[in-house]
Interface confidence: low
């Protein structure tokens, strides 16, 4: 009686079980009563990553330099190419199909976490006692100058965007 199900790494066709092609190979012809499944290796720029009955291999992903991408790991006949972003850019999404420049933290905000190839800059507002007067993807909030340690007094209060201004103490006569 013809089988209705096949073992692992086999598939059912024309009422018989044929072997699947191994990763890195594509199907050329199904098995018959007398012949084995015929498979062929994927070409240099292609891959198949599972036991399969595909008649075409998948094209390796192209890490398009126009989109700020570069090859992180070259593809093989069994694996796809892995792309990553060039310096100064990070992936738009998990699939990393394109990249965007890291954002800068505006004045009044400092860098909480520097960007990586897969995550953007994380900014945080400068708390009281700290400031940032630059737009930067690297600078943290800096503490206000301590006038007292310089034997000076605060002449102008600091803000989240400006440092305090220190000046000499008024001498009492």
């Amino acid at each position: 009686e013809p089988p209705t199900a096949c073992r692992e790494k086999q598939y059912l066709i024309n009422s018989q079980c044929c072997s699947l092609c191994q990763p890195g190979q594509k199907l050329v012809s199904d098995c018959t009563e007398f012949t084995e499944t015929e498979c062929l290796p994927c070409s240099e720029s292609e891959f198949l990553d599972t036991w399969n009955r595909e008649t075409r291999c998948h094209q390796h992903k192209y890490c398009d330099p126009n989109l700020g991408l570069r090859v992180q790991q070259k593809g093989t006949s069994e694996t796809d190419t892995i792309c990553t972003c060039e310096e100064g850019l990070h992936c738009m999404s998990e699939s990393c199909e394109s990249c965007v420049p890291h954002r800068s933290c505006l004045p009044g905000f400092g860098v909480k976490q520097i960007a990586t190839g897969v995550s953007d800059t994380i900014c945080e507002p400068c708390p009281v006692g700290f400031f940032s007067n630059v737009s930067s993807a690297f600078e943290k909030c800096r503490p206000w100058t301590s006038c007292e340690t310089k034997d000076l007094v605060v002449q102008q209060a600091g803000t989240n965007k400006t440092d305090v201004v220190c000046g000499p103490q008024d001498r009492q006569r």
Epitope: P65, N66, L67, G68, E86, G88, L89, M92, S98, C99, V100, P101
Partner: antibody, heavy 120, light 107 residues
Framework: QVQLVQSGAEVKKPGASVKVSCKAS????????VNWVRQAPGQRLEWMGL????????TYNQKFKGRVTLTIDKSASTAYMELSSLRSEDTAVYYC?????????????WGQGTLVTVSS | EIVMTQSPATLSVSPGERATLSCKAS??????VAWYQQKPGQAPRLLIY???DRRTGIPARFSGSGSGTEFTLTISSLQSEDFAVYYC?????????FGQGTKVEIK
Amino acid sequence: QVQLVQSGAEVKKPGASVKVSCKASVYSFTGYTVNWVRQAPGQRLEWMGLINPYNGRTTYNQKFKGRVTLTIDKSASTAYMELSSLRSEDTAVYYCASSYYSNPYANDYWGQGTLVTVSS
Amino acid sequence: EIVMTQSPATLSVSPGERATLSCKASQNVHTRVAWYQQKPGQAPRLLIYLASDRRTGIPARFSGSGSGTEFTLTISSLQSEDFAVYYCLQHWNYPLTFGQGTKVEIK
């Protein structure tokens, strides 16, 4: 609103070159790809190539066989397209078009177009 | 290069009616298709990208569908301002290629 402003119409003789400029207002080009597309009278749109201002990389439509050169002046937020060895069939409206990296080819913003007429 | 073929060349529709435009790719372009609208003397305007994502500010009457080699732009209820030429673009492979356009005219 983002605007791309292109240089004015040009009339050129066969064999000459033309350089069309495309200035971005509101934003600088960094983070955007700039595509150039042309349209001959009554014809479909034709992609000529693109430049990524971030890294200066270019990709061209091989149909133009080295006749097209794309450049960018980031400090002036201006992109340029130069087409050399002009022939009568290059008579067309030339557009610059720009888009954010997340969707690099489906262009959100277009210049008004520059008509280039090639005639002896 | 990938050839994009649009049909019909001209579509005559009455205002308020539905319009269905087709675009076929000569090979698999997955979902890397955008649709543009162009009016005489104007630059193209992006309507749909990645086959079905509507650009911000584009009315909901415009919708896109399809993947692989067959794509459709549907305008659910045509308004007077929708009469124009529509182009599909594939951006799966270089060179990027446009269809020849479908002219939507008033019946």
